[in-house]
């Protein structure tokens, strides 16, 4: 964590309500906020939403936003007809800019965009756009929801009536009606090119208070293809001061965004303040909890035929959505634990988001090496109450790889879980190779609280012509004080430990799409011991084959096209960044060199998802690997882990057998299913598809070991 003492215990950088009128005024505006003592607030912790009311009394009102919209409780309002948009089809000018406010990323609109209709009292002018998102892999990040369904991102466009006020800020300060549109972004398999200028801009405002001009974009293209189906209700700002002055228009249809593009949101940093200490953290989960509807009524538009779609709901969206193709996000919290010398237990937790509930069963795929060939076996785990399975007859000198897939009622599969590596000759579980850069040197290994997500790039082992992509498993990342996933750390190179890249390790993970066809041999792996390899701990962005797999972004993301970035001089932040840059440039050059060297000899890995084809690009990464929040720490004081023996291919290996916990006898109704089964259903889905985001507290995270019942063989 980057700590530094500040002189203002109640700062409000990023206080969204007062985004400046022009770039030139920005530093003045920021200082004015500090001086005026506007209340500091955050999305969690001591200044979190439950405490907003102490400094912003309106936050405790009865007409607050956001809300969950229940479609069947919404009445059709005849007054809610077609929206009239004016200027939305024009390209934005080069004066339009984006700012990382510390609480959101805001686009300050400098062109004339007007909206009327939809029951709005007049012709309203768009002032700014703000975004709210989750923590990773398409997790719920929207503020509003429909039928309990939340989306990865919510974009909000704010409007004021220029006939009544000379500025948006005046309307807010005088507690007068403003308008807001909420647009959901839903995960799609492919990039949405309309978002490119936004994503590009995000890379230029990675750090708090950064600002950048945006490439031209068309605002209409950021809205759903069909605007006819929307909800209307009266609510509030979703951030302090929570003024109850907002006429909300919530579009029913989402806009597509790829996992690759989502990564740009997850890579944004903020500064959090605790007492007199500031820390730099990821800006994630920047959504307000939902508020009670109380006596309000939600209405829905009366636009003819807008709601009469069924399976054709997304046919006007050429990109489709990821939820149409997969059962759920991947199973999470993958763990492998030895039960005894010849048996392993694989356990996991329910996926966080289930697009097509319920999950009926899980498919466990595991593979091992024998004579340089990889054997793979898949079996179905029927019980959805007991999320673990036992693999018996494991050979102690083999390397095993495990992954799990959920299967929904409609036979769709989830994406694969993280791939776990296990070397059964040791019970030590490798937690991943990470070196965390903090403000002060640390002698001890990084604690789980310091594990930082690093969201770009993977590196490829190349030995004897065998490509072997390695991504370390992210574990133990609980929410930080800001509600983000982890504190900040830099991508650093490290010498991987002996053997296959982990000394004394048992577990790591592969990117889901890079299920290697062969593993490195013992000699090949040991040759690699001195190589530097980038460890990444999060879902990778999904570059196409033409994109270099090594991270190319420095701490400021400047080479990503940060244009005319405004200098910042507040609170010594700048000076600190310069130090960072120096060390990171050096690390980056080493890392890039290493990865480039690897890439020269590494062919694109074969995609293994049932929903991806080689034609879609060999380096695509299926989203959804999540951090293992529950893996036990195994570095006990005084405990020295033995090194892994080199991999030995023995001719006497016995293929392991899978045991479903508590089962006896095989199930004739469940033939083994191939893990690469093609999709059996159409890839479209109803926009109203009910999908469930599981409360983590309800998940089965049991780590208890239970003996397999005898004789269950697949």
């Amino acid at each position: 964590v980057l700590h530094y003492v500040v002189c203002f215990p109640a700062l409000t950088e990023g206080y969204v309500g007062t985004l400046q009128e022009s770039r030139q005024d920005s530093s003045v505006q920021i200082r004015r906020r500090k001086a005026s003592g506007d209340p500091y607030w955050a999305y969690s912790g001591a200044y979190g939403p439950e405490h907003w009311v102490t400094s912003s009394v309106s936050c405790g009102g009865s007409h607050q936003s956001p809300i969950d919209i229940l479609d069947h409780h919404a009445r059709v309002g005849d007054e809610y007809q077609e929206l009239q948009l004016d200027g939305f089809d024009n390209e934005s000018s080069n004066k339009t800019w984006m700012k990382n406010t510390g609480k959101t990323v805001a686009i300050l609109l400098k062109d004339d965009y007007f909206v009327s209709g939809a029951g709005l009292p007049g012709r309203f002018k768009a002032e700014k756009v703000e975004f709210h998102w989750g923590h990773s892999n398409g997790s719920a990040g929207s503020e509003h929801s429909v039928n309990g369904r939340r989306f990865p991102v919510e974009m909000q466009i704010f409007f004021y009536n220029p006939d009544d006020f000379d500025s948006f800020q005046t309307a807010i300060s005088e507690n007068r009606i403003i308008g807001a549109m909420a647009i959901f972004f839903q995960v799609s398999p492919r990039d949405n090119s309309a978002l490119d200028p936004i994503i590009h801009g995000l890379k230029g405002v990675v750090h708090h208070e950064k600002e950048t001009f945006l490439d031209p974009f068309i605002l209409r293209d950021l809205l759903p293809a069909s605007l006819g189906s929307y909800y209307r209700y009266t609510g509030s700002l979703t951030t302090p001061p929570c003024s109850e002055i907002v006429e909300w228009i919530v579009f029913r249809r989402p806009v597509p965004i790829s996992y690759h593009q989502l990564e740009a949101f997850y890579s944004i940093f903020t500064t959090e303040q605790q007492d007199h200490v500031k820390s730099v953290e990821y800006l994630r989960n920047n959504f307000r909890p939902q508020q009670a509807l109380n006596d309000r009524v939600v209405s829905k538009s009366a636009v003819r035929d807008a709601w009469n779609h069924d399976l054709a709901d997304f046919l006007d969206n050429p990109l489709g959505t990821e939820a149409s193709k997969v059962c759920s996000s991947p199973p999470i919290h993958m763990k492998v634990q030895p039960l005894n010398q010849t048996a392993l237990q694989v356990s996991w937790s329910q996926p966080e988001t289930i697009y097509h509930p319920p999950i009926m069963n899980y498919m466990i795929s595991y593979s091992w090496t024998k004579n340089e060939d990889e054997k793979e076996k898949t079996f179905t785990k029927d019980s959805d109450k007991d999320l673990k399975a036992t693999i018996s007859h494991v050979s102690p000198d083999s390397l095993y790889l495990f992954r799990v897939q959920a299967v929904c009622r409609n036979d769709m599969r989830s994406d694969f879980s993280q791939t776990m590596l296990f070397q059964a000759n040791t019970t030590r579980i490798f937690q991943g190779t990470r070196i965390v850069k903090t403000g002060v040197p640390t002698a001890s290994p990084a604690s789980s609280a310091d594990m930082a997500p690093i969201s770009s790039g993977s590196s490829t082992w190349t030995s004897s012509g065998i490509p072997f992509s390695f991504v370390s498993m992210a574990t133990g990342m609980g929410p930080s004080s800001s509600g983000s996933q982890a504190t900040v750390a830099s991508v650093v190179t490290s010498t991987l430990l002996a053997g296959l890249g982990f000394g004394g390790g048992g577990i790591s993970s592969f990117p889901s799409t890079v299920w290697p066809t062969r593993l490195p041999t013992a000699s090949a792996a040991s040759k690699q011991a001195g190589r530097t390899v980038l460890a990444t701990t999060e879902a990778l962005a999904s570059p196409g084959p033409d994109v270099h797999s090594a991270p190319s972004k420095d701490s400021e993301g400047t080479e990503e096209g940060e244009k005319e970035e405004k200098s910042e001089s507040e609170d010594g932040e700048r000076e600190h960044e310069e130090e960072e840059k120096d060390s990171e440039k050096k690390e980056k050059s080493e890392a890039t060199h290493t990865a480039a060297e690897s890439d020269r000899t590494a062919p694109a890995p074969t995609p293994s998802s049932p929903h991806r084809t080689a034609a879609e690009g060999g380096h695509q990464t299926i989203p959804g690997r999540r951090q293992d929040h529950s893996a036990p720490a195994t570095d006990q004081p005084g405990h020295v882990a033995p090194d892994l023996d080199p991999l030995v291919d023995t001719a006497t290996q016995v293929p392991p057998t899978a045991t479903e916990e508590h089962y006896s006898g095989s199930d004739p109704r469940r033939p083994e299913m191939p893990s690469k089964k093609p999709m059996s259903r159409g890839d479209r889905f109803s926009e109203d598809s009910k999908f469930i985001t599981v409360n983590p507290a309800e998940k089965n995270t049991s780590g208890m070991l239970s003996r397999p019942s005898p004789g269950r063989m697949e």
Epitope: L311, M360, K385, R409, D411, G665
Partner: antibody, heavy 120, light 111 residues
Framework: QEQQKESGGGLFKPTDTLTLTCTVS????????ISWVRQAPGNGLEWIGA???????YYATWAKGRSTITRATNLNTVTLKMTSVTAADTATYFC??????????????WGPGTLVTISS | SFVLTQPASVQVNLGQTVSLTCTAD??????ASWYQQKPGQAPVLLIY???SRPSGVPDRFSGSSSGNTATLTISGAQAGDEADYYC?????????????FGGGTQLTVTG
């Protein structure tokens, strides 16, 4: 108020095609699944099939081939069509709304049922 | 196919506690639900996900599950509890998906 009601019951002849309709109100078929269940006089409940919120249909093993479940979301109706009926199909037919959770399904709201009698 | 077995009838004295069982021919793969049906009426959901009670269902009704047996327990049985009770669970996916009911138990409350 959320509810559903079956219609289309009555007297049918063997080999007829039975068409029953479940009309729902207060909730959307786009975000809810419906199951059809029947109960022969003096017997237990027997699941016939279901249609989920995305329009996919599922059938009991015995009902496959001669049962079809469809829906019209804009009309708020789900239809069960059963061909080649016999006296054994005499029963009260219920439609029930499914409560679909992450890892389980139950039938949390039932219509009053419609009686179907098959007799020559 | 997947079968759920319930005793055909069970008697309980007024005010006493009774347990109705539902046994799967293989270990229960999914969560069980329980339904109460009174003569001439549609069934009503009593218990879902093995142990959870929908709002409006008295807390005299409780569910549990162990191994391949799900159990519905009615404590302090009342005359109004006299009804048929069905357990159910779901199984399979895709074309093999099934929702299965047990044969039902007729509960008689005496005294």
């Amino acid at each position: 108020q959320e509810q559903q009601k079956e219609s289309g019951g009555g007297l049918f002849k063997p080999t007829d095609t039975l068409t029953l309709t479940c009309t729902v109100s207060g909730f959307s078929l786009s975000s809810n699944a419906i199951s059809w269940v029947r109960q022969a006089p003096g017997n237990g409940l027997e699941w016939i099939g279901a249609i989920d919120n995305s329009g996919s249909a599922y059938y009991a093993t015995w009902a496959k081939g001669r049962s079809t479940i469809t829906r019209a979301t804009n009309l708020n109706t789900v239809t069960l069509k059963m061909t080649s009926v016999t006296a054994a199909d005499t029963a009260t037919y219920f439609c029930a709304r499914e409560d679909v959770r992450a890892d389980s399904i139950d039938l949390n709201m039932w219509g009053p049922g419609t009686l179907v009698t098959i007799s020559s | 196919s997947f079968v759920l077995t319930q005793p055909a009838s069970v008697q309980v004295n007024l005010g006493q506690t009774v347990s109705l069982t539902c046994t799967a021919d293989t270990l229960s793969r999914s969560y069980a639900s329980w339904y109460q049906q009174k003569p001439g009426q549609a069934p009503v959901l009593l218990i879902y996900r093995d142990t959870s009670r929908p709002s409006g269902v008295p807390d005299r009704f409780s569910g549990s599950s162990s191994g391949n047996t799900a159990t519905l327990t009615i404590s302090g049985a009342q005359a109004g509890d006299e009804a048929d009770y069905y357990c159910a669970t779901s199984d399979g996916s895709g074309s093999s998906y099934q929702f299965v009911f047990g044969g039902g138990t007729q509960l008689t409350v005496t005294g």
